[in-house]
Interface confidence: low
């Protein structure tokens, strides 16, 4: 009898209750192999899914999301919001860096702005929520007559996190 | 089903160049950011590169940074790697895989071996 | 550079044993960040984890994650033949990405 299952293609599963007959999936099933004793059920693609591939009798529908998210885990099994620069991803989707933090990449969390201060200098350019903050002469430099010994230093490059 | 099948390694001599090519199938190639990672022989995995889904933004290991360049034909549905001023120590199984971001690297390739060696 | 370490190199069990294997990070990781992999020789590398805990389609209830922070765990609850392989984990907390220099699972 086992020999009779495994004649049955994809598409089709071996029907206990028909002497083993191979059946054809019924609708909204799929089997995408052969001898299978059941047929396992289609993947909707609903809410933030939209659908990809159609289910076929023999393959399972492939999902992607709708605009505004994108894919996660394998086969898409999750939608997540997009992010941009200035926001942070967490498991409840993109969220802005708070007050004094900031996230200049694609990936990774808002991390705080440099502290001009504990090196002696002074805050040249503001930081936003995309950028850190440049720092600058130290307000000692700034005092008549005095020279900058050094320039400012140069803003990270956007994309990656200070080593 | 997703596929991703790289192509064009071989050997080449240090100081050569080489382009490798990742085909990908099964999914809207254009909307997943993707990446190249390698394995030198006996060794464990190191992150070579990404793009972003358009192909506007990419970033580069410390070690291949100004020497290799990402880029990305969705058109083709086709991610390349262009490798320049290549080392004795680039030599590596070379994987493309398609990057979940947060969530890690969902399908990789088979790989294409590159040997650098006079 | 996050630097993720690790242990032990090579963890020799039975099969039906349970494998415990960790990784250290050298600075805090969102356990989101946080993935695994499986590697059999002369093949890719094979997501099992994700987001420190989250089974990739298709993995078998055997193998689990955890941990956060630093600590990340890796467990194989029983094994079975076709688990001895090589195991990474990765962090995808900031760049550049990186992966752990792996634990080979071998046959007792």
């Known amino acids: 009898l086992q020999d009779l299952c495994s004649n049955c293609p994809a598409g089709t599963f071996c029907d206990n209750n028909r002497s083993q007959i191979c059946s054809p999936c019924p609708p909204n099933s799929f089997s995408s192999a052969g001898g299978q004793r059941t047929c396992d059920i289609c993947r909707q693609c609903k809410g933030v899914f939209k659908t990809r591939k159609e289910c076929s009798s023999t393959s399972n529908a492939e999902c992607d999301c709708i605009s505004g998210y994108h894919c996660l885990g394998a086969e898409c099994s999750m939608c997540e919001q997009d992010c941009k620069q200035g926001q942070e991803l967490t498991k409840k989707g993109c969220k802005d860096c708070c007050f004094g933090t900031f996230n200049d990449q694609k990936r990774g969390i808002c991390r705080p702005w440099t502290n001009c201060s504990l090196d002696g200098k002074s805050v040249l350019v503001n930081g936003t929520k995309e950028r850190d903050v440049v720092c600058g002469p130290s307000p000692a430099d700034l005092s008549p007559g005095a020279s900058s010994a050094t320039p400012p230093a140069p803003a990270r490059e956007p994309g990656h996190s200070p080593q | 089903e997703v596929q991703l099948l790289e192509s064009g390694g071989g050997l080449v001599q240090p100081g050569g160049s080489l382009r490798l090519s990742c085909a990908a199938s099964?999914?809207?190639?254009?909307?997943?950011?993707m990446s190249w990672v390698r394995q030198a022989p006996g060794k464990g995995l190191e992150w070579v590169s990404d793009?972003?889904?358009?192909?506007?933004?990419?970033d580069y290991a410390d070690s291949v940074k100004g020497r290799f360049t990402i880029s990305r034909d969705n058109s083709k549905n086709t991610l390349y790697l262009q490798m320049n001023s290549l080392r004795a120590e680039d030599t590596a199984v070379y994987y493309c895989?398609?990057?979940?971001?947060?969530?890690?690297?969902?399908?990789w390739g088979q790989g294409t071996l590159v040997t650098v060696s006079s | 550079e996050i630097v993720l370490t690790q242990s032990p190199g090579t963890l020799s069990l039975s099969p039906g044993e349970r494998a415990t294997l960790s990784c250290r990070a050298s600075?805090?990781?969102?356990?989101?960040?946080l993935a695994w992999y499986q590697q059999k020789p002369g093949q890719a590398p094979r997501l099992l984890i994700y987001?420190?805990?989250s089974r990739a389609t298709g993995i078998p209830d055997r193998f689990s994650g955890s941990g956060s922070g630093t600590d990340f765990t890796l467990t194989i609850s029983r094994l079975e033949p076709e688990d001895f392989a090589v195991y990474y984990c990765?962090?995808?907390?900031?760049?550049?990405?990186?992966f752990g220099q792996g634990t080979k699972v071998e046959i007792k």
């Open positions: 895989a398609r990057d979940l971001m947060v969530y890690g690297f969902d399908y």
């Open positions: 099964g999914f809207t190639f254009s909307s997943y950011d």
């Open positions: 793009i972003d889904p358009t192909g506007s933004k990419t």
């Open positions: 600075q805090s990781v969102s356990s989101s960040y």
């Open positions: 987001g420190a805990s």
């Open positions: 990765q962090q995808s907390y900031s760049y550049p990405v990186t």
